[in-house]
């Protein structure tokens, strides 16, 4: 951990319960030394992670760490699912742990699977 390798610090098993219609920022903490790496977000679809090409992203720079932010403005029901950030560094691809968004659609909350259901039946995330 003392090296200058890029580190992505998304927490293992992290999850976020959010409401459709609200704004939300998904942060990927990025530790680097000299040159800021190229970072992207992707959304898991089964075993593949589909790159999010045309979504609004930004950087937040702090003293010892930076955050690559994926903006949801607003959150939509189909934003439900698991996300991962990846960094390209010296020809290496570094991938974070996945983080899961549980989106509640307030208009049809009674029809949607609960967070507990999705935890025990993760395939509901992809239906």
């Amino acid at each position: 951990k003392e090296s200058c390798d890029v580190q992505l610090y998304i927490k293992r098993q992290s999850e976020h319960s959010i409401l459709a219609g609200d704004p939300f920022e998904l942060e990927c903490p990025v530790k680097y030394c000299a040159n800021r790496p190229h970072v992207t977000w992707c959304k898991l679809n089964g075993t593949t992670c589909v790159k999010l090409e045309d979504r609004q992203t930004s950087w937040k720079e702090e003293k010892n760490i930076s955050f690559f932010i994926l903006h949801f403005e607003p959150v939509l029901p189909n934003d439900n699912g698991s996300y991962r950030c990846s960094a390209n560094f010296q020809s290496n691809l570094i991938e974070s742990h996945s983080t899961t968004l549980y989106v509640t659609d307030v208009k049809s909350a009674s029809e949607r699977p609960s967070k507990d259901e999705m935890a025990s039946r993760p395939w509901l995330l992809y239906r």
């Epitope: 951990k1 580190q7 992505l8 610090y9 998304i10 927490k11 293992r12 098993q13 992290s14 999850e15 976020h16 319960s17 959010i18 939300f24 920022e25 942060e27 903490p29 530790k31 937040k60 702090e62 760490i65 955050f67 974070s96 742990h97």
Partner: antibody, heavy 120, light 108 residues
């Protein structure tokens, strides 16, 4: 230097709700996960749950039905409510910050702890 | 949940001696999801080691962590008077996060 300070009543009656607040100073509550941990007198540590600054939570299943953790970013505070308390909930309650520089869930800053006694 | 078992419960040693504390998980916690804390009477725990072997900020080099899978070790290479305390391990591989029962390092 980040500092955490727990506050709340030191005595709660059985069946009532325990309410504690943790005030964070010397740093922002943003971009971090925050946690509550407790320690019954003379015993070990038990993780209660965490909250992200955006409001997302995760609770220990053993306490889940009785816990609410909330956050107030404008006051740089987060809070714990534990309902239907019994004598078994008597403990020192700590608030703590989850370390940023890891994908794991270690606690790098702790409050000094507050003893909550459940007794009539 | 993952149960963490620490041994021995009490370790009696003299200043200057080497302390070896053991922590065993009921199932594999990978190679790096293990933390160690020190707690002195009347104080909050203090993070010593995270990611199994990374020293937290300000922690002296005499503290080192090792291990992977289910078996982890905290080593204090030469005990100082201020090191006599209770030490806890914590796994952060699976939620809920769980702690070991602690090892008390006391002066012999």
């Amino acid at each position: 230097q980040v500092q955490l300070q727990e506050s709340g009543p030191g005595l709660v009656k059985p069946s009532e709700t325990l309410s504690l607040t943790c005030t964070v100073s010397g740093g922002s509550i943003s971009s971090y996960y925050w946690s509550w941990i407790r320690q019954p007198p003379g015993k070990g540590l038990e993780w209660i749950g965490y909250i992200y600054y955006s409001g997302s939570t995760n609770y220990n299943p053993s306490l889940k039905s009785r816990i609410t953790i909330s956050v107030d970013t404008s006051k740089n505070q987060f809070s714990l409510k534990l309902s239907s308390v019994t004598a078994a909930d008597t403990a020192v309650y700590y608030c703590a910050r989850v370390i940023l520089y890891s994908s794991g869930w270690s606690f790098d800053y702790w409050g000094q702890g507050t003893l909550v006694t459940v007794s009539s | 949940e993952i149960v963490m078992t620490q041994s021995p419960a009490t370790l009696s040693l003299s200043p200057g001696e080497r302390a070896t504390l053991s922590c065993r998980a009921s199932q594999s916690v990978s190679s790096s999801y293990l933390s160690w804390y020190q707690q002195k009477p009347g104080q909050a725990p203090r993070l010593l080691i995270y990611d199994a072997s990374t020293r937290a900020t300000g922690i002296p080099a005499r503290f080192s962590g090792s291990g992977s899978g289910t078996d982890f070790t905290l080593t204090i290479s030469s005990l100082q008077p201020e090191d006599f305390a209770v030490y806890y391990c914590q796994q952060d591989y699976n939620l809920p996060l769980t702690f070991g029962g602690g090892t008390k390092v006391e002066i012999k």
